[in-house]
């Protein structure tokens, strides 16, 4: 859970209590044990742009 008073992390990143900052979810592929990766799994990925109107 994100610390009180912290701005929400941008899409594709998640709050790390161990590091006190937002971390890029992309790094979870290489190191899934990181504490913030739980937040990445819960957050939906950035939406794909539709190819039709």
């Amino acid at each position: 859970e994100q610390a009180p008073g912290q701005a929400p992390c941008s899409r594709g990143s998640s709050w790390s209590a161990d590091l006190d900052k937002c971390m890029d979810c992309a790094s979870c592929r290489a190191r899934p044990h990181s504490d913030f990766c739980l937040g990445c799994a819960a957050a939906p990925p950035a939406p794909f742009r539709l190819l039709w109107p």
């Epitope: 610390a3 209590a17 161990d18 590091l19 006190d20 290489a30 044990h33 504490d35």
Partner: antibody, heavy 120, light 108 residues
């Protein structure tokens, strides 16, 4: 110049308590994760505990969990290790070390160490 | 827990020798491997981080390589000040880190 200076070590009886300090200077202390690592006489390095930059997140080795408490005072640029219920196997030189500034992948600065001897 | 095993535990070498120390992880740790040098009575000193990156101020005769489970620290031409104990450390499971048991480099 980055410096980490441990203090508080000494001789203590089994079951006793000790509080180690690590005074940081030469850098802005508050953004960095910190750890304690120990080294028993003639042995290798053993990670003991970790604390996040704010102090809000802490982790411990199984060997010290429930007995040791890591904390920090960023206003005083100081890291602490409260050691309770000490055992003979806790006898070691205790080092504090600074984590890397982007992640805690490595520990780039270490103190000179303080010796803790647990003996009756 | 991830175990780190170094080999050899000790070695004897002469000034000018090329020295290689290996570190094996009990499971893949990608490239999250660091090397430290420790001299008697002194604190460990970071040499190599993330398997192959040379820490600032460390002589270029030190190099690191490897990924997955097998890693090496190489000293291309051993100098008198290099006689020490070397430790590997995995940070794949940071902040729960583990060290190898150490390799002592002695004078032949």
């Amino acid at each position: 110049e980055v410096q980490l200076l441990e203090s508080g070590g000494g001789l203590v009886q089994p079951g006793g308590s000790l509080r180690l300090s690590c005074a940081a200077s030469g850098f802005t202390f508050s953004p960095y994760p910190m750890i304690w690592v120990r080294q028993a006489p003639g042995k290798g390095l053993e990670w003991v505990s970790y604390i996040s930059p704010s102090g809000g997140s802490t982790h411990y080795a199984d060997s010290v969990k429930g007995r040791f408490t890591i904390s920090r005072d960023n206003s005083k640029n100081t890291l602490y290790l409260q050691m309770n219920s000490l055992r003979a196997e806790d006898t070691a030189v205790y080092y504090c070390a600074r984590g890397g500034d982007t992640y805690f992948d490595y520990f780039d600065y270490w103190g000179q160490g303080t010796l803790v001897t647990v003996s009756s | 827990d991830i175990q780190m095993t170094q080999s050899p535990s000790s070695l004897s070498a002469s000034v000018g020798d090329r020295v290689t120390i290996t570190c094996r992880a009990s499971q893949s740790i990608s490239g999250y491997l660091n090397w430290y040098q420790q001299k008697p009575g002194k604190a460990p000193k970071l040499l190599i981080y993330q398997a192959s990156s040379l820490q600032s101020g460390v002589p270029s005769r030190f190099s690191g390589s490897g990924s997955g489970t097998d890693f090496t620290l190489t000293i291309s031409s051993l100098q008198p000040e290099d006689f020490a104990t070397y430790y590997c450390q995995q940070s794949y499971t940071s902040p729960f880190i583990t060290f190898g048991q150490g390799t002592k480099v002695e004078i032949k």
